[in-house]
C-alpha cells in the first residue's frame, strides 16, 4: 500500500535500505522557496526550519480572507513530498522554508531573487553540506532570474525547478528555462504527461526529465496529521529534489553535472506517450521519468552522456543555432536537424574558452537546431580537428592524429547554398578507421578525445527502402557519443541522439525520389570508459 | 535557454535630457530594458537594475544613489527597495517608467528588467 509515486521513483532495492534508517539524518539541506508552511505537521515536524525570510506581494482583492491553512497549503505539501516521514522521498532530510509566494500562490521575480540571495548569504555565513534549492514556481522568461540561478549553481548549489503547468514550451518560463537548473515536468500514475484542467505540464528542450506530479499524497496544512493529494510540476520537482537529496546524502561530493547525468541515465525511458505534446516539440522533449539512481560505487565508471538541443535558429538565411554543454561536461559531438531539411550543417567552435555546437540554416530553410552530445569524461583532453572543403569531386579526410586520441564525433558544414550539388558526408569505419570523410564542398570537423580507458567504435545501419528515419543503437555497456546521417537521399533532415539511439531523419519527398540502391545510413560513434585500459579505436 | 525566448527587449536610447551633468550627457545608453512578454504578469513601477558583473560593492551603492539624485533633479522620488551584492550586482527600485531612459544611461548598467509575477505550480 505504498503510494504509487514513491513506488515509481524508488526501485525495490532502495525501499528496504530506507526502511532501515528512517530518521538517518544527513548533512544535505533542502531550501524550499514557496508559500508559508505548517511546520507542526507530523510529516515534517522536527525536520523543517521556517526561516524568517518573507518577500511576497500583497494578495489581490479587497475581500481576500487570509486563512492560515490555505496560505500554507502548497508549501506544506511540497515539504512533505521532499522529506515527509511517511510519504516523503528523502525522509531524513532537513528542510528550510523561505516564503516567496503569498496566500494566493503569487510571488515576484524580485522576491525570488532576494530569496536566492538569502540562501547565498546563509551559505557564506555558515558553510554547510550540500545544498538543494527547490523552486516550485514559474513566471515568464526572466533573464535576471535565470542569471541568478546560474550564479548560485556555480557556487555548488543544486537547483531544481518546476517546468510549469501551462502546457507550453518550458523555455518560455523562468526559472524553468535556466540551463543550470534541473527542470522537471510532471507525469501521472500511467507515466503519461499530466493534464491539469485545460492545461498541463510544460515540455520541450528546457525540461530535463519528468517525475510523478498527479494525485500525489502529501502533508495537508489543514491539520497536523492530515494528508491530501495535489498535482502539478511543483510536486514533480519536489520528487526530484528528494532524489537529489538522497543521492547527495550517500555521496556528498557529486556535482550538478554528475547529478543531472545520473538522473537522466537511470531514469525510466520511453514510457511517455509523446503524442500528447505538440508535434514540433516531440523530438525536443525528453522521454524520461525519474527514478532514484544507484550509487556510483555500484555502477562503476560509466561514460555518461546527454543530448542538449539548441533554441531554434529562426528562418533567416544566415541564422545559426548554438547548443552548449555544462562547464564540467565535454562536448563530444555536434549534429544538426531541420524540419525542412534545408540546413548547411554543423560544426564545433570555441567561444570564451568553451566548445559549443553550432548549426547553420540554409537559404529557404525554416530554421535549424544544433544538437550537442554532452558527456562526463573524467580527465579528458578533447580537441577539434577541421579541414576546409575540398575541391569539387574530392573527398576530405579528417582523423585524430594525436597519440591515444579517439574519434568521438564528426560534424560537416557546407559552404554552398545549393543543396542539389552536394552529396552528404560520410564516416568511414572500415578502410579508414576513425576518420570523418566529407564530400564536395563540405568542411569536416572531427572531435578527438583522450581519456584513460576511453575506447570508441563506429556502428552503422542503413535502409534502402522508403523510411522516415533510420536508427542505430549502441549496445549495452557502450554510450552513444556521435550521431550522423550518411549519403543516401539528397535531402536529409539531420541526425540526433535519443539516449543511446542515433536517429537519422529523412525528408518525405526524398523518400519518394530515391532509388532503391541509395541507402540512408545512420552512423553512431559508440564509446565506453574502461579505466584500466588504454584509449583505443575499436575496429 | 541561451537566447531570450518569448521576451520583450527594448532599446531605450532616449535623447539625453540636459541637466548640466557632463558625464550623463556623454554616456550613451547601451543597456537594454526587458519585461515579461505576458502583459498581465508585469509589475510596472518596480525594476531590477542589473549591473555589469565586475561592478564593485561601492559602485553598486553609488549607481543607486546617482539614480536617486538625478531623478530628484527631475522632480521624481524613487525608492531603492533592495541592493543585490551576493549573487549579482544590482538593485531593486520603485520608480516611474519615465525614468527608464535615465537609468539605462547610468554607468555600469547592463540591463534593466521590469519586475513580474511568479506563480506556484
Amino acid at each position: 500500500s505504498i503510494p504509487w509515486n514513491l513506488e515509481r521513483i524508488i526501485p525495490a532495492w532502495h525501499q528496504t535500505e530506507e526502511d532501515r534508517s528512517p530518521d538517518g539524518s544527513s548533512q544535505v539541506e533542502v531550501y524550499l522557496l514557496d508559500t508559508s508552511i505548517q511546520g507542526a505537521h507530523r510529516e515534517i515536524e522536527g525536520r523543517v526550519t521556517i526561516t524568517d525570510f518573507n518577500s511576497v506581494p500583497e494578495e489581490d482583492g479587497t475581500r481576500f480572507h487570509r486563512q492560515a491553512s490555505k496560505c500554507d497549503s502548497h508549501g506544506t505539501h511540497l515539504a512533505g513530498v521532499v522529506s515527509g516521514r511517511d510519504a516523503g522521498v528523502a525522509k531524513g532530510t532537513s528542510l528550510h522554508s523561505l516564503r516567496v509566494l503569498n496566500c494566493q500562490g503569487k510571488g515576484t521575480v524580485s522576491g525570488t531573487l532576494i530569496g536566492l540571495e538569502f540562501i547565498r548569504k546563509s551559505q557564506l555565513i555558515q558553510p554547510s553540506g550540500p545544498l538543494v534549492v527547490l523552486l516550485p514556481l514559474a513566471g515568464g522568461y526572466s533573464r535576471i532570474l535565470n542569471a541568478a540561478c546560474r550564479h548560485l549553481a556555480r557556487t555548488g548549489v543544486v537547483l531544481v525547478a518546476a517546468a510549469g503547468n501551462f502546457r507550453d514550451d518550458a523555455c518560455l518560463y523562468s526559472p524553468a528555462s535556466a540551463p543550470e537548473v534541473i527542470t522537471v515536468g510532471a507525469t501521472n500514475a500511467q507515466d503519461q504527461p499530466v493534464t491539469l484542467g485545460t492545461l498541463g505540464t510544460n515540455f520541450g528542450r528546457c525540461v530535463d526529465l519528468f517525475a510523478p506530479g498527479k494525485d500525489i499524497i502529501g502533508a495537508s496544512s489543514d491539520c497536523s496529521t492530515c494528508f491530501m493529494s495535489q498535482s502539478g510540476t511543483s510536486q514533480a520537482a519536489a520528487h526530484v529534489a528528494g532524489i537529489v537529496a538522497r543521492m547527495l546524502s550517500r555521496e556528498p561530493t557529486l556535482t550538478l553535472a554528475e547529478l543531472r547525468q545520473r538522473l537522466i541515465h537511470f531514469s525510466t525511458k520511453d514510457v511517455i506517450n509523446m503524442a500528447w505534446f505538440p508535434e514540433d516539440q516531440q523530438v525536443l522533449t525528453p522521454n524520461l521519468v525519474a527514478t532514484l539512481p544507484p550509487s556510483t560505487h555500484e555502477t562503476g565508471g560509466q561514460l555518461l552522456c546527454r543530448t542538449v538541443w539548441s533554441a531554434h535558429s529562426g528562418p533567416t538565411r544566415t541564422a545559426t543555432a548554438t547548443a552548449r554543454c555544462a562547464p564540467e561536461e565535454e562536448l563530444l559531438s555536434c549534429s544538426s536537424f531541420s524540419r525542412s531539411g534545408r540546413r548547411r550543417g554543423d560544426w564545433i567552435e570555441a567561444i570564451g574558452g568553451q566548445q559549443v555546437c553550432k548549426a547553420l540554416n540554409a537559404f529557404g530553410g525554416e530554421g535549424v537546431y544544433a544538437v550537442a552530445r554532452c558527456c562526463l569524461v573524467p580527465r579528458a583532453n578533447c580537441s577539434i580537428h577541421n579541414t576546409p572543403a575540398a575541391r569539387a569531386g574530392l573527398e576530405t579526410h579528417v582523423h585524430c592524429h594525436q597519440k591515444d586520441h579517439v574519434l568521438t564525433g564528426c560534424s560537416f558544414h557546407w559552404e554552398v547554398e545549393d543543396l542539389s550539388v552536394r552529396r552528404q558526408p560520410a564516416l568511414r569505419s572500415r578502410r579508414q578507421p576513425g576518420q570523418c570523410v566529407g564530400h564536395q564542398a563540405a568542411s569536416v570537423y572531427a572531435s578527438c578525445c583522450h581519456a584513460p580507458g576511453l575506447e570508441c567504435k563506429i556502428k552503422e545501419h542503413g535502409i534502402s527502402g522508403p523510411s522516415e528515419q533510420v536508427t542505430v543503437a549502441c549496445e549495452a555497456g557502450w554510450t552513444l557519443t556521435g550521431c550522423n546521417v550518411l549519403p543516401g537521399a539528397s535531402l536529409t533532415l539531420g541526425a540526433y541522439s535519443v539516449d543511446n539511439l542515433c536517429v537519422a531523419r529523412v525528408h518525405d519527398t526524398a523518400r519518394a525520389d530515391r532509388t532503391s540502391g541509395e541507402a540512408t545510413v545512420a552512423a553512431a560513434i559508440c564509446c565506453r570508459s574502461r579505466p584500466s585500459a588504454k584509449a583505443s579505436w575499436v575496429q | 535557454q541561451d537566447e531570450d525566448g518569448d521576451y520583450e527587449e527594448l532599446m531605450l536610447a532616449l535623447p539625453s535630457q540636459e541637466d548640466g551633468l557632463a558625464d550623463e550627457a556623454a554616456h550613451v545608453a547601451t543597456a537594454t530594458f526587458r519585461r515579461c512578454s505576458k502583459e498581465a504578469w508585469r509589475l510596472p513601477g518596480t525594476y531590477i537594475v542589473v549591473l555589469m558583473e565586475e561592478t564593485q560593492r561601492l559602485q553598486i551603492e553609488q549607481t543607486a544613489h546617482r539614480l536617486q539624485t538625478r531623478a530628484a533633479r527631475r522632480g521624481y522620488v524613487i525608492k531603492v527597495l533592495h541592493i543585490f551584492y551576493d549573487l549579482f550586482p544590482g538593485f531593486l527600485v520603485k520608480m516611474s517608467s519615465d525614468l527608464l531612459g535615465l537609468a539605462l544611461k547610468l554607468p555600469h548598467v547592463e540591463y534593466i528588467e521590469e519586475d513580474s509575477f511568479v506563480f506556484a505550480q
Epitope: 530518521d23 507542526a40 511517511d86 525522509k91 499524497i217 491539520c223 497536523s224 496529521t225 492530515c226 494528508f227 | -
Partner: antibody, heavy 126, light 106 residues
Framework: QLQLQESGPGLVKPSETLSLTCTVS??????????WGWIRQPPGKGLEWIGS???????YYNPSLKSRVTISVDTSKNQFSLKLSSVTAADTAVYYC??????????????????WGQGTLVTVSS | EIVLTQSPATLSLSPGERATLSCRAS??????LAWYQQKPGQAPRLLIY???NRATGIPARFSGSGSGTDFTLTISSLEPEDFAVYYC????????FGGGTKVEIK
C-alpha cells in the same frame, strides 16, 4: 478483527523508567496505512495523547512529554513499546495503546484512534 | 496547544430523553473533531469523526455537528447503554482531548 493488548509492570518507582508493550493481533503492524499510538488517563481524569509511531520507526510525540518519551516498533513481533523516563506520581494512569490511520493511504479509514486496547494501570510509587 | 472545553461536566437525563453535549475549542479546529464514549473500566470507543461522520457500527441516534470552534454531540433518544463519559478530541494541531461530559441517569 484487530485487537491490541497492553502489557508491562503495574508498579514503577519514582525517577525510574516506565516500560510498556502493545501486542497487535488480527492485523499487521507493518502497514503503511496506520500509526500506532499511546494515550493515558490518570485516575478520574481526562485523556492525554503521549505519542505515535509508524511501522518504519518514524515517531512523533506530545510536545509536553517529548523529552521523556521513546516509542519503538518491532515489526517481527508485531509489537510497539513505550518508555517514559524519570517518572513521578503524576505519571500514574491507565495507559492505552490504539491504532490511528496514517492518512498516507486515504482509503484506510478515518484518521482517529480506533480501536483501543483495554488499558493497563501503572502506579508510580516507592 | 488547542484546549477543548466540554460542557456541562455532568448531564442528568432519563432514558428516552435527548442529550446535547457541547465542546468548544480555544481556536479553530475546522472539522477535525471526534467524539468518544467511555464506560467504566473500558477503553474509549470512537463514535463520531470529522465532526459529523458516524464511525462503523454506531447507531443513528448519535449525531455530530459544528465546525471551527463550536461542536455538538446529540443523542436523540437515550438508551440505557448510552450512560457513560463522552470525550471530544481534536487533531487540527496534534491531539488533545476535552475534560469529558458524564451523562448519568436522573
Amino acid at each position: 478483527q484487530l485487537q491490541l493488548q497492553e502489557s508491562g509492570p503495574g508498579l514503577v518507582k519514582p525517577s525510574e523508567t516506565l516500560s510498556l508493550t502493545c501486542t497487535v493481533s488480527g492485523g499487521s503492524i507493518s502497514s503503511s496505512s496506520y500509526y500506532w499510538g499511546w494515550i493515558r488517563q490518570p485516575p478520574g481524569k481526562g485523556l492525554e495523547w503521549i505519542g505515535s509511531i509508524y511501522y518504519s520507526g518514524s515517531t512523533y510525540y506530545n510536545p509536553s512529554l517529548k523529552s521523556r518519551v521513546t516509542i519503538s516498533v518491532d515489526t517481527s513481533k508485531n509489537q510497539f513499546s513505550l518508555k517514559l523516563s524519570s517518572v513521578t506520581a503524576a505519571d500514574t494512569a491507565v495507559y492505552y495503546c490504539a491504532r490511528e490511520n496514517s492518512g498516507v493511504v486515504p482509503a484506510a479509514g478515518p484518521n482517529w484512534f480506533d480501536p483501543w486496547g483495554q488499558g493497563t494501570l501503572v502506579t508510580v510509587s516507592s | 496547544e488547542i484546549v477543548l472545553t466540554q460542557s456541562p461536566a455532568t448531564l442528568s437525563l432519563s432514558p428516552g430523553e435527548r442529550a446535547t453535549l457541547s465542546c468548544r475549542a480555544s481556536q479553530s479546529v475546522s472539522s477535525y473533531l471526534a467524539w468518544y464514549q467511555q464506560k467504566p473500566g473500558q477503553a474509549p470507543r470512537l463514535l463520531i469523526y470529522d465532526a459529523s461522520n458516524r464511525a462503523t457500527g454506531i447507531p443513528a441516534r448519535f449525531s455530530g455537528s459544528g465546525s471551527g470552534t463550536d461542536f455538538t454531540l446529540t443523542i436523540s433518544s437515550l438508551e440505557p447503554e448510552d450512560f457513560a463519559v463522552y470525550y471530544c478530541q481534536q487533531r487540527r494541531n496534534w491531539f488533545t482531548f476535552g475534560g469529558g461530559t458524564k451523562v448519568e441517569i436522573k
